[in-house]
């Protein structure tokens, strides 16, 4: 069975104060203080379920609960909680009031009882300025006594031996004689026993985390009914108290909801059962990243490794004397750690197998300040294989290149930092390029000519080993255009089509035995190639969608000279839409009427084969339709002044009108515009 422990607010401290040091029971005030430094209020409870009072926290994050003079009704066990909006602390230690004229009963506790080691017994007395005495059962006099030392005292047994076993209790007394004594604490039995074996301790996710991440530590043991304690850098920070744990708990989950930069460090846990403790768990190093700049990770001799061989991963950091960690994607914990005096660390992957393939990254962190870490390095892909993966060859901006232009052939694959070979069909020699971070697989061809066209492929060319087989990439056909007369391109039924409709793009050439190539602006590869028997290729586009909109062109080449292609056809813009785009409306020579002069309004749309209509102040203008989009406006009696807009419809789709253009205002010139001027 497991016990879910959400990192609770640390338990508050409960103590008593009095203004009668010789007879504290005459006026006692209980105080509760939160160690967390922030809480809204405190609740004082008696005997577990009696609600005594609730008090707001002062600036010192504490609250007073005045009890006054003790009466029989005050007898009982008190504890307090801090209480916030969505967080309730664990209970404080219980303060026991046992009578009307007697000091509160102290509480005795001890560190683990380990043979030969020093043991500390803690006696908590609740009131300041009290003396303390430690008793061992069977002995009349106190074993040890301590004067006024605050609210608690620590008794030490230097070296725990069999003779020190037994029942111990402690008492407190008033500072001045005649002493007034407390009841003895409940007895504590000290038994030297073997320690329980260390618990199993891990984090659910990786212990290398970014700020704000959620981290759960899991501490577990096969032993039943245990309480657990979580330590950070050797100090206790949280516990699953038995009183808060389900019976039979064999595990505790300690949750940090949102990790801060100061939460890094060495975490460990222990469990205990009454006086028997476990060995501490193996530590988990929690590293909080993104404090220092990222390191660089490189593979030597390279990132592709033959099975059974070894590879060194070098993590190059920025600062001296850091601790480095190597991480593999998918691995729960860092694979290796290295503490170095310099600013880089070498990690050896020895006799690698297929399971070692994957993305690796590294970090560095300081071990003195909460394990503050760097950003993660860029991932490095390590391939354990006897055969390189196939690279991919493509051209940028396109594999169809006008004569005299520039093009870059890219050989790209999942393996980086490797050399490449570019091979052209029919040529004996190949171009060779060593990979780097800046020009990973780029083969630029400037001022392209007919000699560059043809079929290309590429492959990896590692310089560090010959035992790994290589595979060629896909074949890329590089076409050079501008060597034949251009074809024409038109759309059937027209350049605008509704989504889901079919259309055909017809590329018409002038020469027989031609292969036609359809191109789209922005695409690196031709969309389609056709070798018709005649002079025209019909590129069928069924059920077009919005993404088929764009600017198309076509070229062709002859069977006798493949890859030596024609000039591009004129571009053809295709619109896949239910609503044609709006036209633009402009005025010539200007938007201001001059005496006796007309104005021509020019409506221009992006599609051919359309009919335009003009609107004046929301109504159809007198000269309603125009096929070329030109409308002549005069200003007889000032009727031409006002707002104009225009729309168009396709002749193929006469029921579909475009959006109207943006409005355009025509104005009259200052002065008597329409007034005649007579002489004599």
């Amino acid at each position: 069975e497991e016990t879910e422990i959400v990192m609770p607010t640390p338990k508050p401290e409960l103590w008593a104060e009095t203004n009668f040091p010789l007879a504290p029971w005459k006026n006692l005030t209980l105080w509760c203080r939160s160690p967390s430094g922030s809480t809204k209020e405190f609740v004082l409870l008696k005997d577990g379920t009696g609600w005594i009072a609730t008090r707001p926290a002062s600036e010192q994050v504490r609250a007073a609960f005045p009890l006054g003079a003790l009466t029989q009704s005050h007898t009982g066990s008190y504890h307090c909680h801090s209480w916030e909006e969505m967080a309730v602390s664990e209970p404080s230690e219980a303060l026991e009031l046992v009578g009307t004229d007697i000091l509160p009963k102290p509480v005795i506790s001890a560190s683990p009882t380990i043979r030969g080691q020093e043991l500390q017994l803690r006696c908590k007395g609740w009131l300041a300025g009290m003396g303390f005495a430690l008793y061992k059962e069977g002995e009349q006099e106190p074993v040890q006594q301590l004067g006024a030392v605050g609210r608690e005292a620590f008794f030490t047994i230097q070296r725990m031996e069999d003779k020190d076993e037994g029942n111990y209790s402690c008492r407190t007394h008033t500072e001045k004689r005649p002493f007034k004594w407390s009841e003895p604490s409940e007895p504590l039995e000290l038994v030297i026993k073997e320690m329980y074996p260390k618990p199993f301790f891990k984090t659910w996710a990786s212990p290398v985390v970014t700020p704000g991440a959620r981290v759960t530590f899991n501490c577990s043991t096969p032993h039943q009914h245990m309480s657990f304690i979580l330590y950070k850098d050797g100090s206790e920070i949280a516990s699953s108290d038995r009183s808060w744990a389900s019976p039979g708990a064999s595990a505790a989950h300690f949750l940090i909801i949102s990790v801060g930069i100061g939460d890094g460090g060495n975490y460990s846990c222990r469990y205990y059962d009454f006086s028997i403790w476990s060995e501490p768990s193996d530590p988990v190093e929690l590293v909080v990243t993104e404090f220092y700049p990222k390191p660089t990770l490189l593979a030597q001799p390279g990132p592709v490794v033959f099975p059974g061989k070894s590879v060194i991963l070098r993590c190059q950091g920025t600062f001296q004397g850091m601790r480095f960690a190597l991480l593999q994607e998918g691995a729960h914990v860092p694979l290796q750690f290295r503490s170095v005096s310099g600013n880089s660390a070498d990690f050896l992957l020895h006799t690698v197998g297929a399971e070692d393939s994957g993305n690796y990254s590294c970090i560095y962190y300081e071990t003195t300040m909460s394990n503050r870490g760097s950003y993660l390095s860029m991932p490095l892909m390590i391939w354990v294989t006897d055969t390189f993966p196939k690279p991919w060859l493509f051209a940028e901006p396109s594999s169809v290149v006008p004569m005299g232009q520039n093009v870059t052939l890219w050989c790209r694959g999942p393996v980086h930092g490797v050399g490449y070979i570019l091979h052209k069909e029919g040529e004996a020699t190949s171009m060779q390029l060593w990979g780097s971070t800046s020009n990973d697989g780029a083969f630029p061809i400037t001022n392209i000519s007919g000699t560059s066209m043809g079929r290309y492929s590429c492959c990896y060319h590692p310089d560090w080993t010959s035992s790994i087989k290589i595979q060629p990439s896909n074949t890329l056909e590089l076409l050079v255009t501008g060597l034949l007369p251009k074809p024409s391109l038109l759309a059937q039924p027209g350049p605008m089509v509704a989504p889901g409709e079919n259309m055909t793009l017809q590329c018409q050439g002038e020469l027989p035995d031609s292969t036609f190539v359809l191109l789209k602006e922005g695409a690196q590869e031709p969309l389609e190639q056709q070798r018709p028997s005649g002079y025209r290729a019909d590129f069928w586009m069924p059920a077009v969608r919005g993404e088929d909109s764009g600017i198309y062109s076509c070229v062709y080449y002859l069977d006798s000279t493949p890859f030596a292609a024609s000039n591009h056809s004129d571009s053809l813009e295709i619109w896949v839409t239910d609503k044609p785009p709006k036209p633009s409306l402009s005025a010539w020579p200007s938007t201001m009427f001059k005496l006796g002069k007309d104005i021509t309004l020019q409506c221009r749309g992006p599609l051919p084969g359309v009919e335009f209509v003009l609107e004046h102040d929301g109504e159809e203008a007198p000269q309603q339709f125009s096929e070329d989009g030109d409308f002549v406006i005069n200003n007889v009696e000032g009727k031409g002044i006002g707002n104009y807009s225009c729309s168009y419809r396709l002749q193929a789709y006469p029921d579909i009108w475009s959006e109207p253009s943006d409005p355009l205002e025509l104005v009259g010139a200052a002065g008597p515009v329409a007034q005649e001027c007579t002489v004599g």
């Epitope: 609740v43 009696g50 609600w51 005594i52 909680h81 969505m86 309730v88």
Partner: antibody, heavy 120, light 107 residues
């Protein structure tokens, strides 16, 4: 905003018991205190006791100690008040109320009241 | 137990009047005092908490003052809906206790 809905009116015989429920909706009862207040016909308000559900901790006015039990069920967001050994002077409207904020700053949300009539 | 005493037990006033109700505690309650308004057949409604803090949604014509043992509730300009019974309550120590109430009637 939290709402408190109380159980319906009850008619009881002297010597019997009654258990009134108060269901909170709209927000968790996790960090609130709940109180019970009664009002006899033509009289003022009388504080009976309270509970903090998260602790299961209660406090009762001395007058009701031993005869009144206040409980809460966190899983259903419901508080209960049981009065045993009913007498005719227990005839009253019983209200449950929520303390505002964590600490007590006043009872800011009240139930509609449950009328309990004790009659032979 | 801390006794809370309100005065007057009842008061008659007209719309627009300024009305003051006082509440005295038998021992100091700091500022842990609340004021409530109750209309016939309805549950009480919180007006003021912590002696002087106006509860959200309560009209600004209501105000509270005082600390220790003496407290006042003031209505600066009576409105027709203000005619009701008003109670003070201490929250300094258990048991929390109410005043006997002040009935505000139309003159």
């Amino acid at each position: 905003q939290m709402q408190l809905v109380q159980s319906g009116a009850e008619v009881k015989r002297p010597g019997s018991s009654v258990k009134v429920s108060c269901k909170a909706s709209g927000r968790s009862t996790y960090n609130y205190a709940f109180y019970w207040v009664r009002q006899a016909p033509g009289h003022g308000l009388e504080w009976m006791g309270g509970i903090i559900p998260i602790f299961g901790a209660t406090n009762y006015a001395q007058k009701f100690q031993g005869r009144v039990t206040i409980t809460a069920d966190e899983s259903t967001n419901t508080a209960y008040m049981e009065v045993t050994n009913l007498r005719s002077e227990d005839t009253a409207v019983y209200y449950c109320a929520k303390g505002s904020g964590n600490y007590y700053y006043g009872m800011d949300v009240w139930g509609q009241g449950t009328t309990v009539t004790v009659s032979s | 137990d801390i006794q809370m005493t309100q005065s007057p037990s009842s008061v008659s006033a007209s719309v627009g009047d300024r009305v003051t109700i006082t509440c005295r505690a038998s021992q100091s309650v700091g500022t842990w005092l609340a004021w409530y308004q109750q209309k016939p057949g309805r549950a009480p409604k919180l007006l003021i908490s912590a002696a002087s803090s106006l509860h959200p949604g309560v009209p600004s014509r209501f105000s509270g003052s005082g600390s220790g043992t003496d407290f006042t509730l003031t209505i600066s300009s009576l409105q027709p809906e203000d005619f009701a019974t008003y109670y003070c309550q201490q929250a300094d120590s258990f048991p929390y206790t109410f005043g006997q109430g002040t009935k505000l009637e139309i003159k």
